[in-house]
């Protein structure tokens, strides 16, 4: 069918477009292009008559169109008004007409956009900021980028005005980022320079470091205060409510028990006018106390949560030790110790990480141990397993299915048959089953603590007749002397005997043949080309028997050492040399020849007409099997004697 393809479909102003004609009929009288969706003489652009090779402009011709002998139309220096449909009218040699319509769209090249903002210094949790992408352009799509990534999904981010305006409600310090806007149409895309949003925030509640609150008598006390703030905060220190100094750090050398007390840091932001304070209680000991373990998560979820165990109290210049299962810490990428060894972090906990865990503080003479702590790791449910594994049952027997999924806390179980809920138990029992009990049996395991659910579906067929079995294979194209193949007879059925035949005969005795899985699986070790036979499995019980369709094993082998024929090696000058190479191989090999080491043709037969003594030499045939990845070759010496000479025999 005659069709028109526009190349490109979306055209930039000033560029060109080719209306390409496909399936143009063979014998033509002429053809003509029209602007619009139909043939209309008033809107004819240009016509072309084959016989005279004459192009005739029409009323819609602009001087920017070129018609080609293959009927394609090139329109140059495209303007907006060129957008739309174009119809080709073909008059065939038999004067029968054909028409086809194509179209394209014209878009302007976009300028580089810029971002305007209604608020250059917004205050956190108070102000909103509206960014607008300039200029406004028709038929353009507006996109926004934050730190060179697409906009995150957030209820505080709102696009409006055809995505031209990006509003950030209730700005936060995390909105301090590089913002760019982009304008796109089908022919161009331009990105603005970045605008950095400067959000005023804080001060937050200051943090006093180091975190340890327990010290030994005679040490130096060096406290530092920091509060997140923009612009940076101004700091003041108070001890037991009494002002000390307006600095970020507080230093007291050679402390005593009398330096115990409450230490307050106050942070002030002059732009937001806000103050925040933090108090830490410092205790100065003569000797360290018995340690204890605190945890940031008492019920972590497997593969989701990390757990940080901290040895308390924090005492400067103290060595902390850890034990798991009464042994020192094993080396593991999931176990991390803090710089001071006080905090042990278990990354991505597993069900095996329950413990117990102990920490200790090194004294001058001994180690003080904490009480052991055991983690309660929530996990599962894993994929439930339904037992027994049978899928076929005879009518009249009892169906008893049990479901189990590893889970902490233990899973809650539900059974569904064909999608309909049956009961909320771990076991499903149906007595005296009939064919009507065939269907999809689903066990659903649910862990209420983690909120996770997993299901397993089992197809149960109740039938007096055994189904026609089928053979599944773990390797459809094994390689000779390399691969093993395991055939499995499907399905697994209760009280059923499995049988195998090879080429219509029972299995031969061979150390390379092994039956397993109740004779359901037949494994061929180190396959050979002779194993490329028809394999059939059968199932039978006291009521019925059935056989599978044969499965033929396709063994890939070779290439064997090739044979060059004819065997002659001596020829008379002027004779034709016609050498054929053959190698046993599956799939068929690729052949190539070399004469005196020089590559020739990639054919099975090498033919040289009217040979001369110049054709003396070694003729090598190379064979290659791409499927097995193996190669082989053979070399033959050819002697060509001058016409009058009787050639001597040679091997």
């Amino acid at each position: 069918k005659l069709t028109i393809e526009s190349t490109p479909f979306n055209v930039a102003e000033g560029k060109e477009v080719l209306l390409l004609v496909h399936n143009l009929p063979q014998h033509l009288f002429g053809y003509s292009w029209y602007k619009g969706e139909r043939v209309d003489g008033n809107r004819q652009i240009i016509g072309y008559v084959i016989g005279t090779q004459q192009a005739t402009p029409g009323p819609a011709y602009s001087g920017r169109e070129i018609i080609y002998p293959n009927a394609s139309l090139l329109i140059q220096n495209i303007i907006q008004n060129d957008t739309g449909f174009y119809t080709l009218h073909v008059i065939k040699s038999d004067l029968v007409n054909e028409e086809a319509t194509g179209q394209f769209r014209v878009y302007p090249e976009l300028p580089k956009p810029s971002i305007s903002s209604n608020n250059s210094k917004p205050v956190e949790d108070k102000d909103a900021v509206a960014f607008t992408c300039e200029p406004e352009t028709q038929d353009a799509t507006y996109l926004w980028w934050v730190n060179n990534q697409s906009l995150p999904v957030s209820p505080r981010l709102q696009l409006s005005n055809g995505n031209r305006t990006l509003t950030l409600f209730n700005v936060t310090r995390n909105d301090t980022a590089s913002y760019k806007c982009e304008t796109q149409n089908p022919v161009s895309a331009r990105r603005s320079d970045s605008v950095i949003l400067n959000v005023l925030y804080g001060p937050d509640a200051p943090t006093i470091s180091p975190l340890n609150t327990s010290y030994r008598s005679g040490e130096n006390l060096n406290l530092s205060c920091h509060a997140a703030s923009n612009p940076p905060a101004q700091y003041s220190w108070f001890v037991n409510g009494t002002f000390q100094q307006s600095t970020q750090e507080l230093f007291i050398p050679n402390i005593t028990v009398n330096n115990s007390g409450s230490y307050t840091c106050q942070a002030h932001n002059s732009d937001t006018g806000l103050n925040r304070t933090t108090v830490t209680t410092i205790t100065v000991y003569a000797e360290p106390p018995k340690p204890f373990i605190t945890s940031n998560n008492s019920n972590p979820v497997e593969d989701e949560d990390a757990v940080a165990l901290t040895c308390e109290p924090e005492i400067q210049n103290t060595t902390y030790l850890w034990w798991v299962n009464n042994q020192s810490l094993p080396v593991s990428p999931r176990l991390q110790l803090s710089n001071d060894n006080r905090t042990l972090t278990l990354l991505s906990v597993t069900r095996n990480d329950v413990g117990p865990y102990e920490c200790g503080i090194q004294n001058k003479l001994s180690v003080d141990h904490s009480d052991p702590v055991i983690l309660n790791v929530l996990y599962g449910p894993d994929d439930p397993t339904i037992s027994p594994s049978y899928t076929y049952y005879r009518p009249g027997v009892n169906l008893s299915l049990s479901c189990h999924a590893a889970s902490n806390p233990p899973a809650q179980y539900s059974w569904l048959i064909d999608g309909n809920i049956q009961q909320h138990t771990q076991e499903l029992f149906i007595s005296n089953i009939t064919e009507k009990n065939s269907g999809l049996y689903t066990c659903q395991a649910n862990n209420s603590a983690s909120g996770h659910s997993r299901t397993t579906v089992k197809t149960i067929t109740v039938s007096a007749e055994l189904p026609k079995p089928s053979i599944s294979s773990n390797n459809s194209k094994p390689v000779e002397d390399k691969d093993a193949v395991a055939f499995t007879c499907e399905p697994e059925a209760q009280n059923t005997t499995y049988l195998w035949w090879v080429n219509g005969q029972s299995l031969p005795v061979s150390p390379r043949l092994q039956l397993s899985n109740g004779n359901r699986t037949l494994t061929l070790f180190n396959v050979t080309r002779n194993d490329a036979r028809a394999y059939v499995c059968g199932i039978q019980n006291s009521v019925s028997a059935n056989r599978s369709d044969p499965v033929t094993l396709d063994v890939l082998y070779g290439p064997d050492t090739p044979i060059i024929s004819p065997p002659d090696s001596s020829y008379l000058s002027g004779a034709n040399l016609n050498l054929s190479c053959h190698s046993a191989s599956n799939p068929s090999p690729q052949y190539s020849w070399r004469i005196n080491g020089i590559p020739q043709q990639h054919t099975q037969v090498l033919f040289i007409a009217k040979i001369t003594p110049n054709n003396n030499g070694t003729y090598a045939c190379f064979v290659s099997n791409l499927a097995t990845g193996r190669n082989n070759s053979i070399v033959k010496s050819i002697t060509v004697s001058a016409s009058g000479t009787s050639p001597g025999l040679s091997a």
């Epitope: 003489g41 004819q44 016509g47 008559v49 004459q54």
Partner: antibody
Amino acid sequence: EVQLLESGGGLVQPGGSLRLSCAASGFTFNTYGMSWARQAPGKGLEWVSTISGSGDNTYYADSVKGRFTISRDNSKNTLYLQINSLRAEDTAVYYCAKGGLLWFGELPYPFDYWGQGTLVTVSS
Amino acid sequence: QSALTQPASVSGSPGQSITISCTGTSSDVGGYNYVSWYQQHPGKAPKLMIYDVSNRPSGVSNRFSGSKSDNTASLTISGLQAEDEADYYCSSYISTSTLYVFGIGTKVTVL
């Protein structure tokens, strides 16, 4: 399917006038030139006149030049032939034919479809 | 402009081939490849059979063929059939002022 239907023929006295019409359908009328030919009783075909697809260009046989006027109304898909100063030798069956010219240039195109004709008789 | 010359009649038996000639001058037939042939049965409108010397429109049997040599064009009907009995007219483009001229016509009789 292309159809051409002539009308307007009849008996007219020498020196009289007639206007023949040809209603066209089944093709894009304003893309093709249109023509009139005639055939006197028992005689051969004679080309009379052709008009281009736009109607801008007209052509006449020497025997009718100055007396016959060809025109077309592309909005009605209709071709006309105004016949004045009729003579006895103008007696003929007048055929409307698609073709003669193609598109807007002077590109020859065969008369690929013909109407059934209308008889003009000039007699006193 | 005088009419193109055609034989008054041509006859042939069914199955035979016949050829009708159309002779003009170098100003018409010889000057352009715009020769057409029309078939007209008695009381009927003409029908286009060949155009541009040798091209056949859709629906025309391939028993009809056209050719041209110098100032003479020819229409050949092979495997003559009873329904081919009719008048045949040739036509040629002349110039950009007086566009067309017809032949005097040839009566084809199937014996």
